[in-house]
């Protein structure tokens, strides 16, 4: 079951999944000037059995001018260096979730991938939060959120984390110093790398879009 919403937003914090549950989808998005190859995969899918999980499908991008030409999926070393990483080395990670059965690791980058990844999480997915650079964590509890199914609807639990700009205040015992945001973003751009939604193509979906005249201006 896919989660209906994004994980909660915490001011001055970003979130990251350390591993992805089977059923998670990752959009095949390309950076500007590049597009998904003709009839190429729309998404990567975490699949597997009890002993091994991996990402099905490959994302491939091609120059908009030559869309029917397939590009290599493995980035060159210099491209990997330039690309914003989605990894988050975090002291908040209690276990190596990537080694858990039924989970996939972060997929490797593909050539000309968009700078932000759009994930579609499933029920049971856990994401971890940490404060962006310049902010320190005040923990009231776990700095994590889990997508849960309640009464037939999905919801994310609220992470117990506050990020404060008071760098001088003493740290909690055993608390590590705050680390840089994985994106190195200024605090004015604390939107997260990963977003979620129901990705399936369907013609009869529980979505509504109401178009209306919002305001009328006479000029």
């Amino acid at each position: 079951e896919l989660c209906d919403d994004d994980p909660p937003e915490i001011p001055h914090a970003t979130f990251k999944a350390m591993a992805y549950k089977e059923g998670t989808m990752l959009n095949c998005e390309c950076k500007r000037g590049f597009r998904r190859i003709k009839s190429g995969s729309l998404y990567m899918l975490c699949t597997g059995n009890s002993s091994h999980s991996s990402w099905d499908n490959q994302c491939q991008c091609t120059s908009s001018a030559t869309r029917n030409t397939t590009k290599q999926v493995t980035p060159q070393p210099e491209e990997q260096k330039e690309r914003k990483t989605t990894e988050m080395q975090s002291p908040m990670q209690p276990v190596d979730q990537a080694s858990l059965p039924g989970h996939c690791r972060e997929p490797p980058p593909w050539e000309n991938e968009a700078t932000e990844r759009i994930y579609h999480f499933v029920v049971g997915q856990m994401v971890y939060y940490q404060c962006v650079q310049g902010y320190r964590a005040l923990h009231r509890g776990p700095a994590e959120s889990v997508c849960k199914m309640t009464h037939g609807k999905t919801r994310w639990t609220q992470p117990q984390l506050i990020c404060t700009g008071e760098m001088e205040t003493s740290q909690f015992p055993g608390e590590e110093k705050p680390q840089a945001s994985p994106e190195g973003r200024p605090e004015s751009e604390t939107s997260c790398l990963v977003t979620t939604t129901d990705f399936q193509i369907q013609t009869e979906m529980a979505a509504t879009m109401e178009t209306s005249i919002f305001t009328t201006e006479y000029q």
Epitope: E29, S39, S64, T195, D198, A207
Partner: antibody, heavy 108, light 107 residues
Framework: PGRSLRLSCAAS????????MHWVRQAPGKGLEWVAV????????YYADSVKGRFTISRDNSKNTLYLQMNSLRAEDTAVYYC??????????????WGQGTLVTVSS | YVLTQPPSVSVAPGQTARITCGGN??????VHWYQQKPGQAPVLVVY???DRPSGIPERFSGSNSGNTATLTISRVEAGDEADYYC???????????FGGGTKLTVL
Amino acid sequence: PGRSLRLSCAASGFTFSSYAMHWVRQAPGKGLEWVAVISYDGSNKYYADSVKGRFTISRDNSKNTLYLQMNSLRAEDTAVYYCARDLLGSGYDIIDYWGQGTLVTVSS
Amino acid sequence: YVLTQPPSVSVAPGQTARITCGGNNIGSKSVHWYQQKPGQAPVLVVYDDSDRPSGIPERFSGSNSGNTATLTISRVEAGDEADYYCQVWDSSSDHVVFGGGTKLTVL
């Protein structure tokens, strides 16, 4: 003619902020005409030549709402306007879900 | 970029309907097809030339090569009567382009 109008599209049932969104219109008795598209985060916008410079597409992800600001309206802008969802966040390829549409009539 | 569709196609129930969409080297582009019944919003029936969304019957299929894309509806039913539109993304202009539409009449 010459006046302005703002359309809004309230989306629900999916994570609005993950999808590119389109406006497509259909004049009475005519075919579909694409108007504009905006990427999931609002960073990229593209317009049909017929509306470029007059219409502006925008979105408020915190309100799950898509907008179309229409200025300098002409009689030929009379149509049913559909709000529609793209399959990807910035793919602009496949329109997989459409709103029910709203009729805009421009007349003197 | 221009997509050309025949204005109308007629077919008897149970027969096969083929609706074409012509465009310069359209085979190099991904083509998507929409069905629109009177008074309703369009519905995606085929994407990426030949893939079907969930909920769309197997009777709907597509192909695309050269300068022509084709939507094929086998074992046509009365409920298939509608307007059908092809669509592509034109990378040279950064525009979505629709064909003019084809009215399918089930005799």
